[in-house]
Amino acid sequence: QPPAACPAPCECSEAAKTVKCVNKNLTEVPPDLPPYVRNLFITGNRLGRLPAGALSAPRLAELGSLNLSGNHLRAVEAGALAALPALRQLDLGGNPLAELSPLAFGRASPLEELALRGALREQGALLGLADLLQAGALRNLSRLELADNGLLLLPTGMLGALPALRHLDLSNNSLVGLRNVSFQGLVRLQSLNLSDNSLGVLRNGTLAQWRGLPALRRISLSHNTWVCDCAIEDMVAWLKESDQVEGKEALSCAFPEKMAGRALLKLNTSELNCSAPVDVPSQLQTSYVFLGIVLALIGAIFLLVLYLNRKGIKKWMHNIRDACRDHMEGYHYRYEINADPRLTNLSSNSDV
């Protein structure tokens, strides 16, 4: 049969099963893409949004790799990527996404690699991705790139439904902690990139989760702002015995100032001001629990006093009601006098 036509502004190769529409100022996905396409590069254009049906089978039944980076995309709408039965790789990097619909991929997608480098700088897109992942639409995902997004925190439970995930890239963000991030479901995770963030310490809970991931062999923690106080003691101990961390010898303190530049692996307990055996967070936790108990007791006593004085309170309430009624009747009488023009003089000369 004759080879399929190539959309006017694009470059196509049937042998390479590839279509490239690069820097062509396109405002929409070409509707006449050839059916042989497995690799589709639509990059450096001005798409703005990706609506439902912009990319759809049956014509794109073979599409396996889709690069939509740098297209000024603001919205990926519901169903936009749902009808692509062979889609394995998707790159949405470099788009200022404001909306990423949780239904963008439909109910389930065969997608294995998702790159969102620099595409989640707006909260709406991040929350959309979290919903999308939690809904289980991307259960086949093995690589997730979330680098360069200025992320401070990850939404709770965001990584909970990714049983096939092997590589997670969170580098070059502003992550300050991982307390609300659960890694437990990531049983196949092999590499985790957390370099170039603002992490100050890794807590015991996180370290325990990482220890429990049998496949996790590569953790990158370089260029973070490690705070070398008592709270980092457990992390240092873990670093010394772990073979999971890449270039751990180069990890160094950022704070406090007197510790800046010191290698984490060379820190001693004596330098970390760990005089008290209980770490600060657990002391705080104990204080909060105690405070809670005191407040509960006060509340209980208050309710008990109210209960014991219920008759007196009832009598007091009746008195207040009667007083209010007398007061209101006085107002009512004065209002009626003022309203009758014949009684105006009386009203002004009398003290009702």
Partner: antibody
């Protein structure tokens, strides 16, 4: 290891037919697109024909259109080239060559990445 | 059909020389070009794809460049095992077509 072994070549008279076979081992044949390429004595390479992994797409060079037919039997891991109405100018070494694209591959196209050792076809009266 | 023209058709060079082979397409083929090496009585071997990407296992002295209609294969320092015939091939569209070949011989 990955291997392509051509057979079926020989001397044949003009106007006659010949069927070449290419037996495949070491990879999942049913997932790969395949080609036949030939080389006339002392000359360069000439692409002859292509077939997709499932046989749904076939392309031929103008010089063999209507005379040569490519086919495959995925259950037997074998590629075929049926050559009819042979001419003297069809005399060449015929190579089967695997396309780097497999059914599940969606990265770069590496060209024809695995070649057989070739089988010689001589068309002479 | 797209015609591929290679030059020179043959050249003589010494071990250690820098060798450049050019290939011209009769119409624009973007970067859809491959280079093959063939030694006498042997099957061709893929060297370069997408005009400039080195096939896995191929020595780094081989490099490719070009886009559109003009392409170049360069061997930075010729080695004894590099004496062979080199072919370019376009895969922009069917029918696939090869250049006429460049034979690199020992001076």
């Amino acid at each position: 290891q990955v291997q392509l072994v051509e057979s079926g070549g020989g001397v044949v008279q003009p106007g006659r037919s010949l069927r070449l076979s290419c037996a495949v081992s070491g990879f999942t044949f049913s997932s790969y697109d395949m080609n036949w390429v030939r080389q006339a004595p002392g000359k360069g390479l000439e692409w002859v024909t292509f077939i997709s992994y499932d046989g749904s797409n076939k392309y031929n060079a103008d010089s063999v259109k209507g005379r040569f037919t490519i086919s495959r039997d995925n259950s037997k891991n074998t590629l075929y080239l049926q050559m009819n109405s042979l001419r003297a100018e069809d005399t060449a070494v015929y190579y089967c060559a695997r396309d780097s694209y497999s059914r599940s591959w969606y990265g770069d196209y590496y060209g024809m990445d695995v070649w057989g050792q070739g089988t010689t076809v001589t068309v002479s009266s | 059909d797209i015609q591929m023209t290679q030059s020179p058709s043959s050249l003589s060079a010494s071990v250690g020389d820098r060798v450049t082979i050019t290939c011209r397409a009769s119409q624009g083929i973007s970067s859809w070009l491959a280079w093959y090496q063939q030694k006498p009585e042997k099957a061709p071997k893929s060297l370069i794809y997408a005009a400039s990407s080195l096939q896995s296992g191929v020595p780094s002295r081989f490099s490719g460049s070009g886009s559109g209609t003009d392409f170049t294969l360069t061997i930075s320092s010729l080695q004894p095992e590099d004496f062979a015939t080199y072919y370019c091939q376009q895969y922009n569209s069917y029918p696939l077509t090869f250049g006429g070949g460049t034979k690199v011989e020992i001076k």
